[in-house]
Every structure is written in structure tokens, then in C-alpha cells.
């Protein structure tokens, strides 16, 4: 399809690496949220860190290619990694403009489908890229 995908763009302070080069940041006239127009895919992604009491966004932006999950209309995160005990990284991919702004739902920590508490452990920056 000819039209390019536009996604929400965000990178939490301290996150190593950047996906900024996967698109062109847009001037939306507001400070936040930032928007990015994808160069190499029609697919947005989001990564959230779910702890016992809250979900915190880690990264949002464009994927570098279209792959399974990108056909989704909405952001339906799935568990990917354990950056530290008691927290889980959830990621989504989706294929409509700004679909990565928010997730539709997150399963509670420790629920079926969440990696076990002995799942992969990684340093915070590394775990983001594991999730991607």
C-alpha cells in the first residue's frame, strides 16, 4: 500500500539505542505525544514495563520491517522478557496510524501467558532490545 504509516514515538530516559532512524519525526504542533512517519514498514510497536502496581511505557515507534503481528488493528501486548524480578516487558505490533499510543489491555503479572518468574533476566537496556 502506498500510504506511509504514522506512529507515536517515545523513548524513556535511559533506554539504550534508538529507533528514531526508522522514520521521520513529524511536527504535530504539540510537545507530546511525538509522531513518527515510518520509512521501512507500515508497522508500529510499543513496549510497556508492567510491575505489580503500574504499567510504564518504555518505547514507542516504527518497526524496521513488516512481520507477523503488524496486521493487527490494535495494540494487544504480549509478554516478552523479565528485565528484573517483579516486572515484565510487554510488546505489541500493529498496523494503523497511532495504534501504538495505548494498549487495549495487559494481563495481570503472573497470569497465564506471562513468562514464569524464572524467565529471562537482563539489564534494563538489553531487555528492551530482547523485547523488540
Amino acid at each position: 500500500p502506498p500510504n506511509r504509516r504514522t506512529c507515536v514515538f517515545f523513548e524513556a530516559p535511559g533506554v539504550r539505542g534508538s529507533t528514531k532512524t526508522l522514520g521521520e519525526l513529524l511536527d504535530t504542533g504539540t510537545e507530546l505525544p511525538r509522531a513518527i512517519r515510518c520509512l521501512y514498514s507500515r508497522c508500529c510497536f510499543g513496549i510497556w514495563n508492567l510491575t505489580q502496581d503500574r504499567a510504564q511505557v518504555e518505547m514507542q515507534g516504527c518497526r524496521d520491517s513488516d512481520e507477523p503481528g503488524c496486521e493487527s488493528l490494535h495494540c494487544d501486548p504480549s509478554p516478552r522478557a523479565h528485565p528484573s524480578p517483579g516486572s515484565t516487558l510487554f510488546t505489541c505490533s500493529c498496523g494503523t496510524d497511532f495504534c501504538n499510543a495505548n494498549y487495549s489491555h495487559l494481563p495481570p503479572p503472573g497470569s497465564p501467558g506471562t513468562p514464569g518468574s524464572q524467565g529471562p533476566q537482563a539489564a534494563p537496556g538489553e531487555s528492551i532490545w530482547m523485547a523488540l
Epitope: P2, R4, T6, T21, E24, L26, L39, Y40, D64, S65
Partner: antibody, heavy 117, light 111 residues
Framework: QLQLQESGPGLVKPSETLSLTCTVS?????????WNWIRQPPGKGLEWMGY???????SYNPSLKSRVTISRDTSKNQFSLKLSSVTAADTAVYYC??????????WGQGTLVTVSS | DIQMTQSPSSLSASVGDRVTITCRAS??????????MHWYQQKPGKAPKLLIY???NLESGVPSRFSGSGSGTDFTLTISSLQPEDFATYYC?????????FGGGTKVEIK
């Protein structure tokens, strides 16, 4: 600084495959950017043919998609164009170009390819 | 594909003249208020050179006598005071939709 240099035969016979290579210096083609091919028939305008991205994904102009292939050799920091079943209408100056965004800031000097028997 | 129509196709001007070249797209090249229209200069036997990106942003190293404006479907490249080295052909390019497409060019000649 980033430089691009096209190379390949200047004469190709009708129905054969045109093959060109672009050698990139001063920058790794796997670091960033899209690596494009753009052509310009003599005395005419510019036509974007397609790109290969830093990650290896490709995108082609639908008007050429059935005939064009762009690939890369990361060990040589090169990317290549193949255009099959050429005709006289494919006679053009062929440019390789690097783009961080969706416009073309870095160009090779161009190479003329003539299709003739 | 988005068709890009430049006018005029050629023009004659003198050093010091103000020159305006227009480019009209067959449909809007804006995304959420951002215009994906770019301008290049090409001299005979040379590769095109980027002048303006995203409608109005001057590429590094390009003289300030070049400026761009417009949004939607209608865009303009202006040379405020034509210099001898500005005699060349100018092309617009849109990147709002795939495939990227260029205008047919405007040749600026010496009067």
C-alpha cells in the same frame, strides 16, 4: 564523508539483464539509511527505482517491480541493481543515492547505460 | 502514483532576477500537516543536488537565496536573486506516498 560510486557495463543488449553496483565509502550500509537507485533517460526527468534499507528490506517502484532486484554485499559495503529484459527505453543515466529520510541528500556521479544491439 | 507537474518547463532570466518555479501534485503530499515535498538542482552532466527538503527547509550549505514554500498540492521554489551558478534544471520530488515521484523539471536559462 559519505561517497557513492556506480560501476558496471555501459552497454547492454536488448532482452538481457542490466547489472550495476554502487560502492559506498565513508559509511556502513548496515548502519542506517536507505540505499536507492534512481535513473534519468537522456534529456528527461528522474525516476526512483527502489531501495534496500540498512536492515536489508527492499521497496520497488511498482512500474518496474517485475523486472528489478536490489541486493547488497555487506562485506564489500556495496549494493547492486539488476534490471531484467531491458529495452531501448531503459537507456538512461543510473544514479545510486543514500537517503536518511525520504529525500536524497547523497548521490553518486551517475553512469550511462545504453541498451542497444 | 502521485503525478508532479512543474511550471514553467523552461524560463529565461537575467542575473539578479527573482525566479519562481511551481510544482503541483495530483493529490496532497501532506501528512498530519507536514509537507513531503523536496527540491533539487541539476547541472548538465552532474547528479542532482538537494536544495530544499520538506517544503521549506534549506539543506546545509545551500545559499539562503533559495527558499521553498507551499502545502497540500501547490509548492514554490524561489531564487531571490539569480546568480550565474544558478542556471540549471530544477526538480521537485514528493515522498508522501510510494513510489517517490519527481516533477518533469524546469530549465532556467540565461536571457
Amino acid at each position: 564523508q559519505l561517497q557513492l560510486q556506480e560501476s558496471g557495463p555501459g552497454l547492454v543488449k536488448p532482452s538481457e539483464t542490466l547489472s550495476l553496483t554502487c560502492t559506498v565509502s565513508g559509511y556502513s550500509i548496515t548502519s542506517d539509511f536507505a540505499w536507492n537507485w534512481i535513473r534519468q533517460p537522456p534529456g528527461k526527468g528522474l525516476e526512483w527505482m527502489g531501495y534496500i534499507s540498512f536492515s536489508g528490506s527492499t521497496s520497488y517502484n511498482p512500474s518496474l517491480k517485475s523486472r528489478v532486484t536490489i541486493s547488497r554485499d555487506t562485506s564489500k559495503n556495496q549494493f547492486s541493481l539488476k534490471l531484467s529484459s531491458v529495452t531501448a527505453a531503459d537507456t538512461a543515466v543510473y544514479y545510486c543515492a543514500g537517503s536518511r529520510y525520504s529525500w536524497f541528500a547523497y548521490w553518486g556521479q551517475g553512469t550511462l547505460v545504453t541498451v542497444s544491439s | 502514483d502521485i503525478q508532479m507537474t512543474q511550471s514553467p518547463s523552461s524560463l529565461s532570466a537575467s542575473v539578479g532576477d527573482r525566479v519562481t518555479i511551481t510544482c503541483r501534485a495530483s493529490e496532497s503530499v501532506d501528512t498530519y500537516g507536514n509537507s513531503f515535498m523536496h527540491w533539487y538542482q541539476q547541472k548538465p552532466g552532474k547528479a542532482p543536488k538537494l536544495l530544499i527538503y520538506r517544503a521549506s527547509n534549506l539543506e546545509s550549505g545551500v545559499p539562503s537565496r533559495f527558499s521553498g514554500s507551499g502545502s497540500g498540492t501547490d509548492f514554490t521554489l524561489t531564487i531571490s536573486s539569480l546568480q550565474p551558478e544558478d542556471f540549471a534544471t530544477y526538480y521537485c520530488q514528493q515522498s508522501n506516498e510510494d513510489p517517490y515521484t519527481f516533477g518533469g523539471g524546469t530549465k532556467v536559462e540565461i536571457k
